[in-house]
Amino acid sequence: PTGAVEVQVPEDPVVALVGTDATLRCSFSPEPGFSLAQLNLIWQLTDTKQLVHSFTEGRDQGSAYANRTALFPDLLAQGNASLRLQRVRVADEGSFTCFVSIRDFGSAAVSLQVAAPYSKPSMTLEPNKDLRPGDTVTITCSSYRGYPEAEVFWQDGQGVPLTGNVTTSQMANEQGLFDVHSVLRVVLGANGTYSCLVRNPVLQQDAHGSVTITGQPMTFPPEA
């Protein structure tokens, strides 16, 4: 409607690393003569409309969200209604709505995408000794405490992708971070390098691990 307060937020999701602080940007255009006494600002979880933080009756009513949110009080009068979310957790991921009411009202939703980098993969081999060409080995690539779920790629020493006989499992811990274990079953050649790449799709961060297997030369029993 004509004259309704226009609330603006970023179109793209805000990406925040677990444990860091995130700013959910929100702004409105104050009319001439605007004072904070006229402002009613509500931040809420979009899906449930659960209150996160509010500014009403001319004052900051504080955080209703685990005491981890704050406004920018010095900037409110200029139309900056952004919300600071401290110590971001996986559970914070989702959509937040900025609802502004002055003479009329308007709202807009901004998405928070949480991310955590994966650790450098550790590689284990089973069996890990007396290996000969032709043996079947299991190579496990493990990377820890990332978010969201990873994409895992295997390749050989020549960079050829290995897609068969790969089993990948991802388990979330109590914080919602994922531990990824990817298992490659491969028949050994004379020598071989096997690499695993663990990619965080949000951060576009790749973590690499590799193992080089030197097979024992083939020995034959002496002829009678």
Partner: antibody
């Protein structure tokens, strides 16, 4: 259980105004949005505007801008919708419906409570 | 102006399952549109069934469920009852206003 009780039927002349009331009883929900919705004979539902009584702020549909005024009296838990310059095509049933700005229960039920409707007939 | 499209009419049988949809001219419906579904029967005031895309209002039978399907808001009635014959309106929130769809007349045969 919250109820919305609306004022009675009205018969009005073209060019005049009508003011319909909507009283909430049986408990309140913080920062509710009281919407006004109308339905002309044989037509669908049409949103006219809404008010947040706690804040005293209202919004209007473009179509009704300048012709409708929505107000609220928090002390009596009553919202009002006044429509001016009435025409015959304003003949309709007018409803108030409560939505929530903040869901204290953590569940957003939407426009879960409706008034019984007020019939407004515009005729010369 | 924002236009919303619903199926004008649908027919189903008692015990069957039917899905009503609501498409927006602005693009895909999201959770921030807070899709509402309202049931209207002749001579009665409208009744809010679903709010916030998929939250059943108190008193709404469990056979009614709301969702987003292929960028549209959807109302599914599983195990349709004869008393479900009515007109169903969707409503979507756009920042500062509600917009209603034209309604779907559901016939039970």
């Amino acid at each position: 259980q919250v109820q919305l009780v609306q004022s009675g039927a009205e018969v009005k002349k073209p060019g005049s105004s009508v003011k319909v009331s909507c009283k909430a009883s049986g408990g309140t929900r913080p920062a509710a949005l009281i919407n006004w919705v109308r339905q002309a004979p044989g037509q669908g539902l049409e949103w006219m505007g809404g008010i947040i009584p706690l804040f005293g702020t209202a919004n209007y549909a473009q179509k009704f801008q300048g012709r409708v005024t929505i107000t609220a009296d928090e002390s009596t838990s009553t919202a009002y919708m006044e429509l001016s310059s009435l025409r015959s095509d304003d003949t309709a049933v007018y409803y108030c419906a409560r939505d929530q700005v903040v869901a204290t229960s953590g569940v957003n039920f939407g426009m879960d409570v409706w008034g019984q409707g007020t019939t407004v007939t515009v005729s010369s | 102006d924002i236009q919303m499209t619903q199926e004008p009419s649908l027919t189903t049988s008692p015990g069957g399952t039917v899905t009503l949809t609501c498409r927006s001219s602005t693009g895909a419906v999201t959770t921030s549109n807070y899709a509402n579904w309202v049931q209207e029967k002749p001579g009665q005031a409208p009744r809010g069934l679903i709010g916030g895309t998929n939250k059943r209002a108190p008193g709404t039978p469990a056979r009614f469920s709301g969702s987003l399907i292929g960028g549209k808001a959807a109302l599914t009635i599983t195990g349709v009852q004869p008393e479900d014959e009515a007109i169903y309106f969707c409503a979507l929130w756009y920042s500062n206003l509600w917009v209603f769809g034209g309604g779907t007349k559901l016939e039970i045969k």
